[in-house]
């Protein structure tokens, strides 16, 4: 997370850390708890060449990475079938946990938005994660969860910005309908935040608007952060994840 600050302990109870096996269970992406047994993340975190179940764990909300790990095994990794690269889209995946999480005030699910929600500019939105704090600058110990408030940008404006200084023709969309843009040169997500949630407060409820997906650098001029637009994939999500009763 570029800019922003350490998150208060009481906030973002749906935030999770994805861990990959190595010399230690290393954080590599974020995710969000959308059901007691399901995590939403980015497809590029776990695909297109899917890792072994044995190589992956999920850590629920913790204030500092690695300090009180209780790693959870995953029973299924579901990558959106249309995913190839983040820039093309469909950068969304689901992880099914072997056991449902015991929800509490500290750890619970985030609400998915209604299909009609557009998340217009001006809406109060935040992105969270344990990713880099600037381009090629890692989050330092004790690795606190960070948060930053990011401004939403309309897709057509964001697409125009991404065409500035790019070789892509103006008639070729870079920012697609299944994407959402947020951030500026002072506030952005970054490497290691991928898969984590962009949430917006709508009528008093936090809704997950996006999944951290891609961008050219972090907090670069004319290059806002790009997120997978959750509303675009609600039907796909609910094909696997039970709706709340």
């Amino acid at each position: 997370i570029v800019g922003g600050q350490e998150a208060p302990r009481s906030k973002w109870p749906w935030q999770v850390s994805l861990r990959v096996h190595g010399p230690y269970w290393m954080h590599f992406c974020g995710g969000s708890l959308i059901h007691p047994q399901w995590v939403l993340t980015a497809a590029h975190c776990v695909g297109p060449d899917v890792k072994d179940l044995a190589a992956l764990r999920v850590q629920l909300r913790e204030q500092h990475l690695y300090y009180q790990d209780q790693l959870l095994p995953v029973s299924r990794i579901i990558v959106h079938p249309q995913f190839y690269t983040a820039q093309i889209g469909a950068d969304i995946a689901l992880l099914e946990l072997e056991e449902p999480v015991n929800v509490s005030s500290h750890v619970h699910t985030v609400t998915l938005p209604p299909a009609s929600e557009t998340f217009p500019p001006g809406m109060p939105c935040w992105v969270t994660g344990w990713g880099d704090v600037d381009n090629d600058e890692r989050l330092p110990p004790p690795f606190p969860l960070k948060q930053v408030k990011v401004p939403i940008m309309e897709n057509h404006i964001c697409d125009a910005k991404y065409h500035l200084g790019a070789y892509t023709g103006d008639d070729v969309r870079i920012v697609r309908d299944d994407m959402l843009c947020a951030g500026n040169t002072r506030r952005d997500s970054c490497q290691g935040d991928s898969g984590g949630p962009l949430v917006c407060k709508v009528n008093g409820t936090w809704l997950q608007a996006g999944v951290v997906s891609w961008g050219e650098g972090c907090a670069q001029p004319n290059r806002p952060g790009i997120y997978t637009r959750v509303t675009y994939y609600l039907d796909w999500i609910h094909h696997y994840v039970p709706k709340k009763p």
Partner: antibody
Framework: EVQLVESGGGLVQPGGSLRLSCAAS????????MVWVRQAPGKGLEWVAF????????YYADTMKGRFTISRDNSKNTLYLQMNSLRAEDTAVYYC????????????WGQGTLVTVSS | DIQMTQSPSSLSASVGDRVTITCSAS?????MYWYQQKPGKSPKPWIY???DLASGVPSRFSGSGSGTDFTLTISSLQPEDFATYYC?????????FGQGTKVEIK
């Protein structure tokens, strides 16, 4: 001592049913995913089914889906395999095994129990 | 489903020989697991996460590989190594074992 002891095997007619049990001791049973593996006479190992620590997730080999049911009773430290509609090709030694908590290999095995399906 | 193919199915070797068993997965996996079984006995864990030796396994054993091709190697075969070895993946369900490689005395 960490131990798994299977029981319940025996001779059963085709179409019949049998319930295997696996008694666990020497470790916190409720912390571990458990697995059944079988081995037909003179053949190789074949994975049968998996059950997660709290029973929320179960998976079966395709040939056993719908006929076999894996379950567990954590209060009794016991794993079960209910086998219905048994066929001659289900004849095998059935092993109960524990999945290692960190590394997912099968680190503790029972001695096995022989199931013979024959008329 | 991922299929596992071991080769050879059996081999004859002498004490002191270097022995290599291969396991090929039908699609890419991260890790390979190996088990040793002797006649009339339960299988024992032998190698996990491709190259880590299970407790009590002698250092003459090693494992390697990535993607779809993995190997178990015995640098200098000893009398107690004559057994059948099985590979297994833990990529996704259903789990599958290789058909086994029987290491026999020449």
């Amino acid at each position: 001592e960490v131990q798994l002891v299977e029981s319940g095997g025996g001779l059963v007619q085709p179409g019949g049913s049998l319930r295997l049990s696996c008694a666990a001791s020497g470790f916190t049973f409720s912390d571990y995913g458990m697995v059944w593996v079988r081995q037909a006479p003179g053949k190789g190992l074949e994975w049968v089914a998996f059950i997660s620590s709290g029973s929320s997730t179960v998976y079966y080999a395709d040939t056993m889906k719908g006929r076999f049911t894996i379950s567990r009773d954590n209060s009794k430290n016991t794993l079960y395999l209910q086998m219905n509609s048994l066929r001659a090709e289900d004849t095998a030694v059935y092993y109960c095994t524990r999945r290692n908590y960190d590394d997912f290999y099968f680190d503790v095995w029972g001695q096995g129990t022989l199931v013979t399906v024959s008329s | 489903d991922i299929q596992m193919t071991q080769s050879p199915s059996s081999l004859s070797a002498s004490v002191g020989d270097r022995v290599t068993i291969t396991c090929s997965a039908s699609s890419s996996v991260t890790y390979m697991y190996w088990y040793q079984q002797k006649p009339g006995k339960s299988p024992k864990p032998w190698i996990y996460r491709t190259s880590d030796l299970a407790s009590g396994v002698p250092s003459r054993f090693s494992g390697s590989g990535s993607g779809t091709d993995f190997t178990l190697t015995i640098s200098s075969l000893q009398p107690e190594d004559f057994a059948t070895y099985y590979c297994q993946h833990y990529h996704s369900y259903p789990l599958t074992f290789g058909q086994g490689t029987k290491v026999e005395i020449k």
